[in-house]
């Protein structure tokens, strides 16, 4: 249903070796980074926090897709994570490395 | 080209009558809001102020389309504009009604 | 304020498996790290492995396979288990929050290994 | 995989100043921070310096780390050594592979 489409935080589980990032990530080996997704339609949902340009954007595309597209769900709160990693070659530890993961989505 | 398909501002006029808005905005008829249009494919570039949890959803993305979505072209930044407005009555203006267009696009 | 407290056995068979939790209070497990630490009667410290606060894990390799963390994030415990105790397994297992640095520790619990 | 040595004890004078060595066995000193805890008998470890030469809140600052490239060590400096200071220090370090690594230890005993 559209309801169940709708912009809303979802699992992914980012595995540092997958993306390469292991050659300075010692630990830990990945993480859950989460991601956005679903759809922003009008009239858009007051926990997803809209931005003015965001309602009248979506209003618009509504009205006219042709006009403007659709408002896009995106992260709009992060969270750091702890790593390990290698700074010019020392092992170092860093407890708040920021913005690596999810912890609201909304639509802008 | 690609690099013309890119996350960038583009314009988006708004006409308050066309979405409803003129029963409350007395002025201006319409403002130019812009709209963020376009991909973020890894690697994205730095005038799109990419958080790390957008780089990594690129990259994962693109070594996986079905693990991961595309960051997203939203606006990440926002202006105000000057209206005359209707308040419970009585034609009030506001210098700075805030959120209104889109100054700067980025990968979120 | 902050606590951590394990709970387990005081006495487990060799060859059996060895269940902990950690309990936690006074934080988030999503925001702070919880290692794992253990050390046999006069001797020293040993860490065996981090629940990290982004739901990664990492192990001591010394443990090899017999090793597994996990955590409820609802219900604010970290669990250890390992499988295929040995007597030389006997040891008082800690569990120790990670910020800046490790700032908290759970009084530990002596668990030994012994038919 | 390096290993952290430390020796097993030593004994110091109250209001003496003492200094305990953790010698990496392979590899460079500097190439990751140092940790050191504190562990009273039957007690609880406590952390004691943090990135090798930081000071947790509520930790004297008769406790100071460094660092000694030439011996490839760090150091724990106990200055105005006191009756409670009495316990056994763990040295710690990071490495790519055992990520989080201890000394042995070494029991300080004050006369």
């Known amino acids: 249903n559209a309801k169940g489409n709708y912009c809303k935080r979802t699992p992914l589980y980012i595995d540092f070796k997958e993306i390469g990032w292991d050659s300075w990530i010692i630990a830990p080996p990945g993480y859950e980074a989460y991601e956005c997704r679903g759809v922003c339609n009008y009239p858009l949902a007051e926990h997803l926090t809209p931005t003015k340009h965001a309602i009248i954007q979506a209003l618009v595309h509504l009205k006219n897709s042709q006009k403007a597209s659709k408002a896009c769900c995106v992260p709009t709160k992060l969270e750091p994570i702890s790593i390990l990693y290698l700074d010019k070659g020392v092992v170092t530890y860093k407890f708040k490395y920021e913005g690596m993961a999810v912890s609201e989505c909304g639509c802008r | 080209n690609a690099k013309g398909n890119y996350c960038k501002r583009t314009p988006l006029y708004i006409d308050f009558k066309e979405i409803g808005w003129d029963s409350w905005i007395i002025a201006p008829p319409g403002y130019e809001a812009y709209e963020c249009r376009g991909v973020c494919n890894y690697p994205l570039a730095e005038h799109l102020t990419p958080t790390k949890h957008a780089i990594i959803q690129a990259l994962v993305h693109l070594k996986n389309s079905q693990k991961a979505s595309k960051a997203c072209c939203v606006p990440t930044k926002l202006e105000p504009i000057s209206i005359l407005y209707l308040d419970k009555g009585v034609v009030t203006y506001k210098f700075k009604y805030e959120g209104m267009a889109v100054s700067e696009c980025g990968c979120r | 304020q902050v606590q951590l407290k394990e709970t387990g056995p005081d006495l487990v068979q060799p060859t059996q498996t060895l269940d902990i939790t950690c309990t936690v209070s006074?934080?988030?497990?999503?925001?702070?790290?919880v290692h794992w630490v253990r050390q046999p009667p006069g001797k020293g410290l040993e860490w065996m492995g981090t629940m990290w606060n982004g739901g990664g894990i990492d192990y001591n390799s010394a443990f090899k396979s017999r090793l597994a963390i996990s955590r409820d994030t609802s219900k604010s415990e970290v669990f250890l288990k390992m499988d295929s105790l040995q007597t030389d397994d006997t040891a008082k297992y800690f569990c120790?929050?990670?910020?800046?640095?490790?700032?908290?520790w759970g009084q530990g619990i002596m668990v030994t290994v012994s038919s | 995989q390096f290993a952290l040595i430390q020796s097993d004890s030593m004994s110091t004078s109250l209001g003496s100043t003492v200094t305990l060595s953790c010698k990496r066995s392979t590899g460079n000193i500097g190439s990751s921070y140092v940790y050191w805890y504190q562990q009273h008998e039957g007690r609880s470890p406590t952390t004691m310096i943090y990135?090798?030469?930081?000071?947790p809140d509520g930790v004297p600052d008769r406790f100071s780390g460094s660092i000694d490239s030439s011996s490839n060590s760090a150091s724990l400096t106990i200055n105005d050594v006191q009756v409670e200071d009495e316990a056994i220090y763990f040295c710690?370090?990071?490495?790519?592979?055992?990520?989080?690594?201890f000394g042995g230890g070494t029991k300080l005993t004050v006369l």
């Open positions: 990135d090798g030469d930081k000071r």
């Open positions: 006074g934080f988030s497990l999503t925001t702070y790290n």
């Open positions: 120790a929050r990670l910020g800046y640095y490790v700032d908290y």
């Open positions: 710690q370090s990071f490495s790519s592979g055992i990520k989080f690594i």
